[in-house]
Every structure is written in structure tokens, then in C-alpha cells.
């Protein structure tokens, strides 16, 4: 094909890959027809003047995971049609100036994972035609105004996992095109207002995993086609009351991992969108009424891991389109009555490792659909009757590690999952906690006539006598409630991310990995 | 007879991590849980954490991130692994249980303690 | 988290006398629904893990004699000891389990 080197493969659609630690410089002679090149995994350590010059032609050119760590200015002569270039995974600290100068074809710059200390306005006043530039993984600490004043075209600027410490307000301003910028793991402080004003088309936002601590009000009033926005990780404590307001495309939000006190009424202002909002490890320590009534697409909301101890009968008002609603990990004693009554189509709620003492008797009386409850590890002894009559779609049940008073009072109860054991699950059932000499024995087939009788002794049962037998298999695997692999925060659909951890970890949510994003 | 009995104490370097066992006996880890106590020489009592029948767990908020406890109900032994030690780590390490009181957070049966000493 | 806070640290009381020791917490350990106070009251002998005396702010552990009382609502609770034996030498330490447990800091009791 042209002479293709001995180190390299070379394929009829003129695509030319040369990959080895036994390559030190690039082969040569190269097809004079190859429109892709990629040289991976090699020992190059520098690129001289015009490597390239007879493969005119190249569009693709993918120098990746190799000892490069100097560049001649001429390295990239001659390649007028080149649109991809990939520099990523090398050992560059220094771009020289005029790098890419005649690249007037490239669309695609990719200088991710190197060692980059600084970039300079002169490095990509070229790029005129650039639509991506992916600088993350070096260790840049600012960026110079008039960075990217040239990239009038720019679609999509990742600047994430470097060291930025600032960010100049006027550093953004010329890229009216941008749709994706990312900002995530760097040390950002605070954003100035401004900072994202010229960012009229902008679709997504990544500033996880910084140091962020106030949010300017205004700061995303002009990005009205954002969709995902992504905050957690930071350290923001409050949240400014119209910050949100003006996002009306909006359909992610991740919040958790900050340091949020409170939430305050129409907060989230009309998302119509959006569909989960995680807020899961924050401080948050109380929830007012219509704090998401705005939201009234919302699927799935995350509030575990906070120190909530108060919710309002009204804060749930206006999510009525809600599946999954997580509040295990917080410091609730008590809910009201009606605190779900507006949450129609609720499926799963997690309710584990509070501090319930007693659930109201109407507590679940308007979510028909619920399949799944949560309540174990709280301070449970006994339950209202007729809790559970009308959940007929309910298929997964956890009461256990919860002090189950076993005295009569819990015949009705006892009844109950006595008919219905296959929703408590095998691993682990509820035992019961007093009097003493029951003290470890399961609550289902204790034998109550032992304990010691209650005060009050009730007609026995109003927990329906039918057993359940479900018309199709329980849980599907790939929902169960119990599935002890889950993503332990939502994966944030990123292209270029290498990896997402999966954990065994159950406690971010108490929910499912298919549920999990 | 109910009887706890912790051990894995000794020296260990600052940075360093620790791993307890309390093996009991009397009763099952099955219905029963088991709380974590500590108590540095002269000074206080300071819970750490409870594992409860049904394997639940819930830590002290300050320790959270250090702090895991574990069982195996087979073994009938509770194990506390502390990670990222320091100096005021030393201490006197107790497991509890909630045998006959009516306190569902009621610790009425312990063990001797096992000591634990951070230093380089 | 739950402060508790007891006074005095150490009490010094002739055989026979009454000792009394205080336990307030930074927010009320009573639960409006249950009617109960979360406190519960621990004595620590010289060398020995600490014993349970009384939950519930009030009500004494089987096997604990009936000099030893408690009482209190809310954030402010009291353990008393009518009339103070030589057994009764110990480091008394009250407990919250409204939240997460914490203990107070302990008051150490004497003969005088």
C-alpha cells in the first residue's frame, strides 16, 4: 500500500497505525495516501521539523501514549486537510508557538493527560475552524484572557482535572457556540459573575469536584439552553434564591457533596425537564413546604446522607410525577400524615437508617403503586393497622433491625407478614426487641402468648388475610431494590470520562443501579 | 453465660489502621447488635458505632469516614477496622451489647476493653 | 450532633448524704409522639467498663438499687443518689440516644 513502514499496519482505507515500544521516531517512508495515522504506545520522545510532509492528505492524525514530551513548531507542516489531532496521553509540558499554524482544516484538538503548565492566546489564534478542544488532565493553573478569544466556532472546551485556581470572567466571552464546557476537578473557589454570560447555547456544565463555596445569583442567567449541570463535590453552603431560575431546559442537576444547610421554597424555579435532582451528603436539615413544586417532571429525587429531621406536609407538592424518592441516612423521628399524599406514582421510597419511632396509620394512603419501602434500621415497635392494605403492587418490604415491641399489640402486624413473607425477602427478617424473654426471635413466628401482654389488647387482625402471589416475577434483577452493586453517584454521561466506579457500597441511596442514572 | 470479648489491641503507627475483633458468646449476633465504645486515660466515654441483628450499621458522624464495623454471625465475632490512625486514636476499646434492658441504645453487657495506643 | 453537658465534674458527699448530678443537652431528647426522653444514665467503677443505671430519663435497669434515680424533660435531667454508699464511688456519665448516641462528659463522684 505505498510502503507501508515494517512497524506500522496499513489498511485499504488508507488508515495507517503504528504502534510498539520499539518505535523511537516516526516511520517512515508513510503512505503517501493515508488519510488516518495513529502512533500509539511507542517510545517517541519528540517530533523534528515535517514528519509528515508527504501525507498531505491525513485527516486524522492520533499521536497517543507515547515518551513525547518535545515538539518542533514544524512538526505539523504541510497537513492543510487535517481535521483530528490527538496529542493525548504524552509527556508534553510546553507547546510551542505556531504549533498549529496552517492546520486550517482542524476541527478536533485533543492535548488531554500531558503535563501542560500554561497555554497562551498565541497557541490556538489559528485554530479559526476549531469545534473541540480537550485540555484536561495537565496542570494548568490559569488561563490567560484571550485564551480562546479565536475559537469562534468552539462546540466543546473540556478544562477539567487541572489545577485552575481562578477563572478570569472575560476568559469565555467570544464562544458563542460553545455547548459543552467542563471545569471539573480543578480548585476553583468561586466563579465570577459574568464568567458564563456569553455562553448563549451552552447545553452543559461541569464544575464538579472543586472548592466552590457561594454561587454568584446570576451566574447562569443567560445560559436559558443548559441541560446539564453539573455541582457536586464543592463546598456550597447556600444556594442564592434565583440562581436556578432561568434554566428552563434543564434536565440533570447534581447537587450532592456540598455543604447545603437549607433549601428554600421555589428554589429549583421552573425546571419543567428536569427528571432526578441529587442532593444526597449535604447538611441539609429540614425541608419547607413546595420546595419542589416546580418540578413537576421529576423522576427521581436524592435526599439520603443529609441531617434532615423536620419535613413540612407540604414539601413534596407538585411531584406528582416522582418514581424514587431516597431519605434513608437522615434524622427523621417523625413525618406527617400527608407528607406523600401528593406522590401518585411513587414506586420506591427509602426510608432505612432514620430515626422513625412510629409511622402515621395514612402515611402511604395515596401511593397505590409503591413496590418497594425501606424502614429498616430505624426505632420502629410496632406498626399502624392496616399500613400496607392497599399497596398491591408492593414486592419488597424491609423492616428488619428495628425495635419491635412483641407484645400483643403486634398480632395484627405479625398476621400480616405471616401472609406476605415473600415481600420481607430471605436474607434478613424482623426479630423482635421486647419484652426481653422474646428478645431475637423473629417476629413472624414468634409465639405472642409468651410475651408480656400490652395494656391494650385490639380485635385481631385488620392486615388483609389474602397471601400475596404475584402475577409476574417479583422484582426483575435488574431493578431490585436489593442489588448490591450500585453507581455511587449518577455517571455524568461524559465521552471522554476513561472510567466509572462501581462500588458495593448500598449506602449512597438505597436504591437500584438501573435506578442510579 | 453472655460474655464479650475484644481483642487486636497494641501499638500501631500514626497513618496507620486497626482492627479489632469482639467474639461473644451467650447469645446470637443474629438478634442481638453490638456498639462500639471507646475511652482515651482520664477521659470520657465516646460511642463510635452499632451493628445491629440484621447487619445495619450507624456510625458516629464525626469518625464516619474512618470507621467500619463488620461481623461474621457464623464466627459469632464484630469487628471495628479504623483507618488513618492518630494520636488521639489511643484509647480503651469496648464492645457492648443490649442484652436485657428495655433501651434499644441501652449498652448493659461489655467487655474488658482492649487498648489501643497510637505513636511512632 | 447532640451536646450533652454534665455539672459538676466531681462531687465530693459524706456517706449516707445525697448526691445529685445534671445532664443538659443542646436540643430537647423528648419525643412528643412516644412521650419519651432518650437519656439514659452509665456508672463507671475505677478499672471496670461502665455499667447501664437508668433509661428513659427515669426508669431504673433491673438490679440497680433504689437509691439511684432520674429524672427530667426536655434538655435538663437530674441523677440522684439518695443516700451515697462506698460502692457508689464512681465516674456517672449520662447518655442521649434521641439522635445518634453521645455521651456527657462525665462527673466523678467522692467521699468526702
Known amino acids: 500500500y505505498h510502503g507501508c513502514p515494517s512497524e506500522c499496519t496499513c489498511s485499504r482505507a488508507s488508515q495507517v497505525e503504528c504502534t510498539g515500544a520499539r518505535i523511537v521516531a516516526v516511520p517512515t517512508p508513510l503512505p503517501w495516501n493515508a488519510m488516518s495515522l495513529q502512533i500509539l504506545n511507542t517510545h517517541i520522545t519528540e517530533l523534528n521539523e515535517s514528519p509528515f510532509l508527504n501525507i498531505s492528505a491525513l485527516i486524522a492524525l492520533r499521536i497517543e501514549k507515547n515518551e513525547l514530551s518535545r515538539i518542533t513548531p514544524g512538526a505539523f507542516r504541510n497537513l492543510g486537510s487535517l481535521r483530528y489531532l490527538s496529542l493525548a496521553n504524552n509527556k508534553l509540558q510546553v507547546l510551542p508557538i505556531g504549533l498549529f499554524q496552517g492546520l486550517d482544516s482542524l476541527e478536533s484538538l485533543l492535548l488531554s493527560s500531558n503535563q501542560l503548565l500554561q497555554i497562551q492566546p498565541a497557541h490556538f489564534s489559528q485554530c479559526s475552524n476549531l469545534k473541540e478542544l480537550q485540555l484536561h488532565g495537565n496542570h494548568l493553573e490559569y488561563i490567560p484572557d484571550g485564551a480562546f478569544d479565536h475559537l469562534v466556532g468552539l462546540t466543546k472546551l473540556n478544562l477539567g482535572k487541572n489545577s485552575l485556581t481562578h477563572i478570569s470572567p472575560r476568559v469565555f466571552q467570544h464562544l458563542g457556540n460553545l455547548q459543552v464546557l467542563r471545569l471539573y476537578e480543578n480548585r476553583l473557589t468561586d466563579i465570577p459573575m459574568g464568567t458564563f454570560d456569553g455562553l448563549v447555547n451552552l447545553q452543559e456544565l461541569a464544575l464538579q469536584q472543586n472548592q466552590i463555596g457561594l454561587l454568584s445569583p446570576g451566574l447562569f442567567h443567560n445560559n436559558h439552553n443548559l441541560q446539564r449541570l453539573y455541582l457536586s463535590n464543592n463546598h456550597i453552603s447556600q444556594l442564592p434564591p434565583s440562581v436556578f431560575m432561568q434554566l428552563p431546559q434543564l434536565n440533570r442537576l447534581t447537587l450532592f457533596g456540598n455543604s447545603l444547610k437549607e433549601l428554600s421554597p421555589g428554589i429549583f424555579g421552573p425546571m419543567p425537564n428536569l427528571r432526578e435532582l441529587w442532593l444526597y451528603d449535604n447538611h441539609i436539615s429540614s425541608l419547607p413546604d413546595n420546595v419542589f413544586s416546580n418540578l413537576r417532571q421529576l423522576q427521581v429525587l436524592i435526599l439520603s446522607r443529609n441531617q434532615i429531621s423536620f419535613i413540612s406536609p407540604g414539601a413534596f407538592n407538585g411531584l406528582t410525577e416522582l418514581r424514587e424518592l431516597s431519605l434513608h441516612t437522615n434524622a427523621l423521628q417523625d413525618l406527617d400524615g400527608n407528607v406523600f399524599r401528593m406522590l401518585a406514582n411513587l414506586q420506591n421510597i427509602s426510608l432505612q437508617n432514620n430515626r422513625l419511632r412510629q409511622l402515621p396509620g395514612n402515611i402511604f394512603a395515596n401511593v397505590n403503586g409503591l413496590m418497594a419501602i425501606q424502614l429498616q434500621n430505624n426505632q420502629l415497635e410496632n406498626l399502624p393497622l392496616g399500613i400496607f392494605d392497599h399497596l398491591g403492587k408492593l414486592c419488597e418490604l424491609r423492616l428488619y433491625d428495628n425495635p419491635w415491641r412483641c407484645d400483643s399489640d403486634i398480632l395484627p402486624l405479625r398476621n400480616w407478614l405471616l401472609l406476605n413473607q415473600p415481600r420481607l425477602g430471605t436474607d434478613t427478617v424482623p426479630v423482635c426487641f421486647s419484652p426481653a424473654n422474646v428478645r431475637g426471635q423473629s417476629l413472624i413466628i414468634i409465639n405472642v402468648n409468651v410475651a408480656v401482654p400490652s395494656v391494650h389488647v385490639p380485635e385481631v387482625p385488620s392486615y388483609p388475610e389474602t397471601p400475596w402471589y404475584p402475577d409476574t416475577p417479583s422484582y426483575p434483577d435488574t431493578t431490585s431494590v436489593s442489588s448490591t452493586t450500585e453507581l455511587t453517584s449518577p455517571v455524568e454521561d461524559y465521552t471522554d470520562l476513561t472510567t466509572i466506579q462501581v462500588t458495593d457500597d448500598r449506602s449512597v441511596w438505597g436504591m437500584t443501579q438501573a435506578q442510579s442514572g | 453465660e453472655v460474655q464479650l470479648v475484644e481483642s487486636g489491641g497494641g501499638l500501631v503507627q500514626p497513618g496507620g489502621s486497626l482492627r479489632l475483633s469482639c467474639a461473644v458468646s451467650g447469645f446470637s449476633l443474629t438478634s442481638y447488635g453490638v456498639h462500639w465504645v471507646r475511652q482515651a486515660t482520664g477521659k470520657g466515654l465516646e460511642w463510635l458505632g452499632v451493628i445491629w441483628a440484621g447487619g445495619s450499621t450507624n456510625y458516629n458522624s464525626a469518625l464516619m469516614s474512618r470507621l467500619t464495623i463488620s461481623k461474621e454471625n457464623a464466627k459469632s465475632s464484630v469487628y471495628l477496622q479504623m483507618n488513618s490512625l492518630r494520636a488521639g486514636d489511643t484509647a480503651m476499646y469496648y464492645c457492648?451489647?443490649?442484652?436485657?434492658?428495655?433501651?434499644?441504645?441501652?449498652?448493659?453487657?461489655w467487655g474488658q476493653g482492649t487498648t489501643v495506643t497510637v505513636s511512632s | 450532633d447532640i451536646v450533652m453537658t454534665q455539672s459538676p465534674d466531681s462531687l465530693a458527699v459524706s456517706l449516707g448524704e445525697r448526691a445529685t448530678i445534671n445532664c443538659k443537652s443542646s436540643?430537647?431528647?423528648?419525643?412528643?409522639?412516644?412521650?419519651?426522653?432518650?437519656l439514659a444514665w452509665y456508672q463507671q467503677k475505677p478499672g471496670q467498663s461502665p455499667k447501664l443505671l437508668i433509661y428513659h430519663a427515669s426508669t431504673r435497669e433491673s438490679g440497680v438499687p433504689d437509691r439511684f434515680s432520674g429524672s427530667g424533660s426536655g434538655t435538663d435531667f437530674t441523677l440522684t443518689i439518695s443516700s451515697l454508699q462506698a460502692e457508689d464511688v464512681a465516674v456517672y456519665y449520662c447518655?442521649?440516644?434521641?439522635?445518634?448516641?453521645?455521651f456527657g462528659g462525665g462527673t466523678k463522684v467522692e467521699i468526702k
Open positions: 457492648a451489647t443490649h442484652m436485657i434492658t428495655e433501651d434499644y441504645y441501652g449498652m448493659d453487657y
Open positions: 447518655k442521649q440516644s434521641y439522635n445518634l448516641p453521645t
Open positions: 436540643q430537647s431528647l423528648l419525643n412528643s409522639r412516644t412521650r419519651k426522653n432518650y
